[in-house]
């Protein structure tokens, strides 16, 4: 059976939108009016993984691009990156673990925890125009809460 996917945009809890910053990086910044068209549209795929009451495993691809958010070790630190894939083989139900995030929705907080690196979350900085990154559980002022906006296919 084909993997179930939906198209959406994400904004952090400070209402910063996510946009491309070069070919393999996302950044978060406030957008208004026509600039909103810059924000990336994700294709969120519901994939195989450990499901629990609060966690749903998903993969986050960029719509109509063969790029997926993935989590890898760089210099011994869990790191978020955009990774190119073969569009003939992706998305798929059994995604490699580096592509899988636990979507956690509690009391209107939406978080994305790396399945590969538990306790590491997709994060944005308080500051404007900074890269989206993978942050630890004690991230201080870093933002890990998002809202999701559905986009029609």
């Amino acid at each position: 059976a084909p993997v179930r996917s939906l198209n959406c945009t994400l904004r952090d809890s400070q209402q910063k939108s996510l946009v491309m910053s070069g070919p393999y990086e996302l950044k978060a910044l406030h957008l208004q009016g026509q600039d909103m068209e810059q924000q990336v549209v994700f294709s969120m795929s519901f994939v195989q993984g450990e499901e629990s009451n609060d966690k749903i495993p998903v993969a986050l691809g960029l719509k109509e691009k063969n790029l997926y958010l993935s989590c890898v070790l760089k210099d011994d630190k869990p790191t978020l990156q955009l990774e190119s894939v073969d569009p003939k083989n992706y998305p798929k139900k059994k995604m490699e673990k580096r592509f899988v995030f636990n979507k956690i929705e509690i009391n209107n907080k939406l978080e994305f925890e790396s399945a590969q690196f538990p306790n590491w979350y997709i994060s944005t900085s308080q500051a404007e125009n900074m890269p989206v990154f993978l942050g630890g559980t004690k991230g201080g002022q870093d933002i890990t809460d998002f809202t999701m906006q559905f986009v029609s296919s």
Epitope: S52, D54, N107, N119, Y121, T137, K138, T144
Partner: antibody, heavy 120, light 108 residues
């Protein structure tokens, strides 16, 4: 402000089922997560389990097979049932509101006064 | 299973600084919370997210965390601070909740 009040029989016979109810006043039970915690006399606090209105639950592994938690939204109450009790289940039982502060961190910000249940 | 370890008791004289420690393998990743429980009463949250103080809690209560150790500090302890103190955290893997064994603080 939100207040919690536990109620139920203070004495339960061994092998029977302990049933407790927590009544939430001053707020809606539907919008939050709720936990049960117990404290045997002279001992420390022990988390029993938590649930959310949608049916999401997490139970203490050692008690999982004996626990049932449910909710009655019309009465703004939630309940705990613990089956096959023994003297080791004698404790003060507390209900508490379970708050999520993000990044996998949960805590209890509001507690009931507690009710003593003796198994004898 | 995940455990939090506290000293069973701490004693100070009034006006002295009391420090209660809590150690646990998940504390580098998860926040520590501290509850005060006076005799015959329900626990009250005195510190959350390692070092934040809820409104209504006196400034003499503070918290810190470094590595696998969290510390509750009561600067200028008063007789009314005599109570059991429990550290608490969330198990890293499965959302199960863990309390330390409790520390009896005596102020005399």
């Amino acid at each position: 402000q939100v207040q919690l009040q536990e109620s139920g029989p203070g004495l339960v016979k061994p092998s029977e089922t302990l049933s407790l109810t927590c009544t939430v006043s001053g707020g809606s039970i539907s919008s939050d997560y709720w936990s049960w915690i117990r404290q045997p006399a002279g001992k420390g606090l022990e988390w029993i389990g938590r649930f959310y209105n949608s049916g999401r639950t997490n139970y203490r592994p050692s008690l999982k097979s004996r626990i049932t938690m449910s909710v009655d939204t019309s009465k703004n109450q939630f309940s705990l049932k613990l089956s096959s009790v023994t003297a080791a289940d004698t404790a003060v039982y507390y209900c508490a509101r379970d708050m999520y502060s993000g990044r996998g961190n949960w805590y209890f910000d509001l507690w009931g006064r507690g009710t003593l249940v003796t198994v004898s | 299973s995940y455990e939090l370890t506290q000293p069973p008791s701490v004693s100070v004289s009034p006006g002295q600084t009391a420090r209660i420690t809590c150690s646990g393998d998940a504390l580098p990743k998860k926040y520590a919370y501290w509850y005060q429980q006076k005799s015959g009463q329900a626990p009250v949250l005195v510190i959350y997210e390692d070092s934040k103080r809820p409104s209504g809690i006196p400034e003499r209560f503070s918290g810190s965390s470094s590595g696998t150790m969290a510390t509750l500090t009561i600067s200028g302890a008063q007789v009314e601070d005599e109570a059991d103190y429990y550290c608490y955290s969330t198990d890293s893997s499965d959302n199960h909740r863990v309390f330390g064994g409790g520390t009896k603080l005596t102020v005399l």
